[in-house]
């Protein structure tokens, strides 16, 4: 199973490194339903 790695900022997903934007500093809407920034 894919596992999110909150410490490293990366996760192994289908044999490649994917940036884990669920990281604390993410501003891309990682949290379901959390308003991010303004209306764009």
């Amino acid at each position: 199973d894919a596992e999110f790695r909150h410490d490293s900022g990366y996760e192994v997903h289908h044999q490649k490194l994917v940036f884990f934007a669920e990281d604390v500093g993410s501003n891309k809407g990682a949290i379901i339903g959390l308003m991010v920034g303004g209306v764009v």
């Epitope: 999110f4 410490d7 604390v24 809407g29 990682a30 379901i32 339903g33 959390l34 308003m35 991010v36």
Partner: antibody
Framework: QVQLVQSGAEVKKPGASVKVSCKGS????????VHWLRQAPGKGLEWIGR????????IYTPKFQDRVTLTEDTSTDTAYMELSSLRSEDTAVYYC?????WGQGTLVTVSS | DIVMTQSPLSLPVTPGEPASISCRSS???????????LYWYLQKPGQSPQLLIY???NLASGVPDRFSSSGSGTDFTLKISRVEAEDVGVYYC????????FGQGTKVEIK
């Protein structure tokens, strides 16, 4: 008014595929992740996966890995969720979510 | 998968009175970065869900301060200090320490 507008209800046969759309209205969908969830009748919420429209990067729940495809068309501010090899257990309301906005839900009914 | 278990599954409430919902995770949601990856959502009748609380104790925008959440790594409680009629619906806890999984939901209704 800022909203996510999903496509209408679908009725599909077992084994078929369905493609649900999610269009940003007054909202630039390419900036934030688009999450997809579903809710079977009388059941709880289940996360399917998410797509980063900026680069097309996707993450799926392992349960759906082999049957679901999340895509986006940034030129039309629309995200898509396609689910293949449908079975009766896939009957559910499917939701897209981006930033603080939720789509109204799309009911997909799988019945022979 | 991390399993989220809620109790009770049904909660009759009286307006003006407090109410609480419990949620337990099969694995600690407290990460070594100090963040607890626990969330609460409310789905009002006939509506899409909405986020109430994120990362265990943070109130989402527009959520009344009568809602609060606390807990340890595996045991969590959502509290409503004084229930209002508009609070009825199904409450879900969720985690995203590893992907996203949700509890089975707690239906809150007026007595």
């Amino acid at each position: 008014q800022v909203q996510l507008v999903q496509s209408g209800a679908e009725v599909k046969k077992p084994g078929a595929s369905v493609k649900v759309s999610c269009k940003g209205s007054g909202f630039n969908i390419k900036v934030y992740y688009v999450h997809w969830l579903r809710q079977a009748p009388g059941k709880g919420l289940e996360w399917i996966g998410r797509i980063d429209p900026e680069n097309g990067e996707t993450i799926y729940t392992p349960k759906f890995q082999d049957r679901v495809t999340l895509t986006e068309d940034t030129s039309t501010d629309t995200a898509y969720m396609e689910l293949s090899s449908l079975r009766s257990e896939d009957t559910a309301v499917y939701y897209c979510v981006s930033s603080g906005y939720w789509g109204q839900g799309t009911l997909v009914t799988v019945s022979s | 998968d991390i399993v989220m278990t809620q109790s009770p599954l049904s909660l009759p409430v009286t307006p003006g009175e407090p109410a609480s919902i419990s949620c337990r995770s099969s694995k600690s949601l407290l990460h070594r970065n100090g963040i607890t990856y626990l969330y609460w959502y409310l789905q009002k009748p006939g509506q899409s869900p909405q986020l109430l609380i994120y990362q265990m104790s943070n109130l989402a925008s527009g959520v009344p301060d009568r809602f609060s959440s606390s807990g340890s790594g595996t045991d969590f409680t959502l509290k409503i200090s004084r229930v209002e009629a508009e609070d009825v619906g199904v409450y879900y806890c969720a985690q995203n320490l590893e992907l996203w999984t949700f509890g089975q939901g707690t239906k809150v209704e007026i007595k």
